[in-house]
Amino acid sequence: FERTRSLQDPCSNCPAGTFCDNNRNQICSPCPPNSFSSAGGQRTCDICRQCKGVFRTRKECSSTSNAECDCTPGFHCLGAGCSMCEQDCKQGQELTKKGCKDCCFGTFNDQKRGICRPWTNCSLDGKSVLVNGTKERDVVCGPSPADLSPGASSVTPPAPAREPGHSPQ
């Protein structure tokens, strides 16, 4: 079956990193510089992505895979495959169309990206405030006052490495 298919379509034999060159009797030709083919049987090679300006190269283009970009310091990736770089703000700020803006009282942002969010209202979930909120941190809710009997202690677990708003790079 494989032999039959290749007789019908010689291009199916061309591996990744090459293309089926119609100008040369459908011979498998290597992808030219600054281009790639990530799958076999391709009739053209794709142009490599170039990481320019605020983008920087995370992974160089090869004959079989596209370049990957990330952002220069002070910016973070947005969109599929880091299609955009967005300005970082400080914790306690949010990025608006007019630039970075401090969070209003009663809101926080513990990221360099994203919005200022209202502090959690612990009482709505039947809990009490253990630690007050700041511009950079949400309140910490604990058990409701009724749950805190003598001898009971409330332990706040350590924060995980990544908070919402950070995309894996």
Epitope: E86, R113, P118, D125, V139, C141
Partner: antibody, heavy 120, light 106 residues
């Protein structure tokens, strides 16, 4: 493949409570806020609230405060929305949706929806 | 609380351009996101941050936002674009959706 899979349809009596689940796969649940949005038959989208899966911090739309509780179990990569004191007007499709990364808060992936019918 | 106003319905012939508006006080200062919802399906994000397209969304979908109006534009409309479209913003403590616009392809 990023996916949010919700629990099945529910029929409840007025005054009862319902708890809908939303299991996340294909991404690190701790990294993204989870929202709940509902849609009554023939009506538009109505935001209910969010949870920070990392800390458990929540924010609820004023309309639902006191009746809705959003929780999560990160070990099971699952978020929950419980709505109490149900009335007929709560008949709706309930969606979970992952918050994206755009400026100003977008919802980039949605569950398939859970129909909750409140009827005596 | 912040309100977003959309026309209930918009009709367009195949191949033509559809424009769906979303009105709000000084909406140009906010980031607007647009969702497409087909009958019996969950919403799908088609435009974020006023004018950016998620991967997989055709280039025919575009957005703009200034002053008191944001606009979703669908060029070369196809029968498969028939759906409800919702705009959405974040306003200080809540997520706000427009009432939705039903796009009919004639």
């Amino acid at each position: 493949q990023m996916q949010l899979v919700q629990s099945g349809a529910e029929v409840k009596k007025p005054g009862a409570s319902v708890k809908v689940s939303c299991k996340a796969s294909g991404y690190q649940m701790r990294g993204y806020y989870m929202h709940w949005v509902r849609q009554a038959p023939g009506q538009g989208l109505e935001w209910m609230g969010w949870i920070n899966p990392n800390s458990g911090g929540t924010n609820y739309a004023q309309k639902f405060q006191g009746r809705v509780t959003i929780t999560r179990d990160t070990s099971a990569s699952t978020a929950y929305m419980e709505l109490s004191s149900l009335r007929s007007e709560d008949t709706a499709v309930y969606y979970c949706a992952r918050e994206g990364e755009a400026v100003g808060l977008d919802l980039d992936y949605w569950g398939q929806g859970t129909l909750v019918t409140v009827s005596s | 609380s912040y309100e977003l106003t959309q026309p209930p319905s918009v009709s367009v012939a195949p191949g033509k351009t559809a424009r769906i508006t979303c009105g709000g006080n000084n909406i140009g200062s906010k980031s607007v996101h647009w969702y497409q919802q087909k009958p019996g399906q969950a919403p799908v994000l088609v435009i974020y941050y006023d004018s950016d397209r998620p991967s997989g969304i055709p280039e025919r979908f575009s957005g703009s936002n200034s002053g008191n109006t944001a606009t979703l534009t669908i060029s070369r409309v196809e029968a498969g674009d028939e759906a409800d479209y919702y705009c959405q913003v974040w306003d200080s403590s809540s997520v706000v959706f427009g009432g939705g616009t039903q796009l009919t392809v004639l």
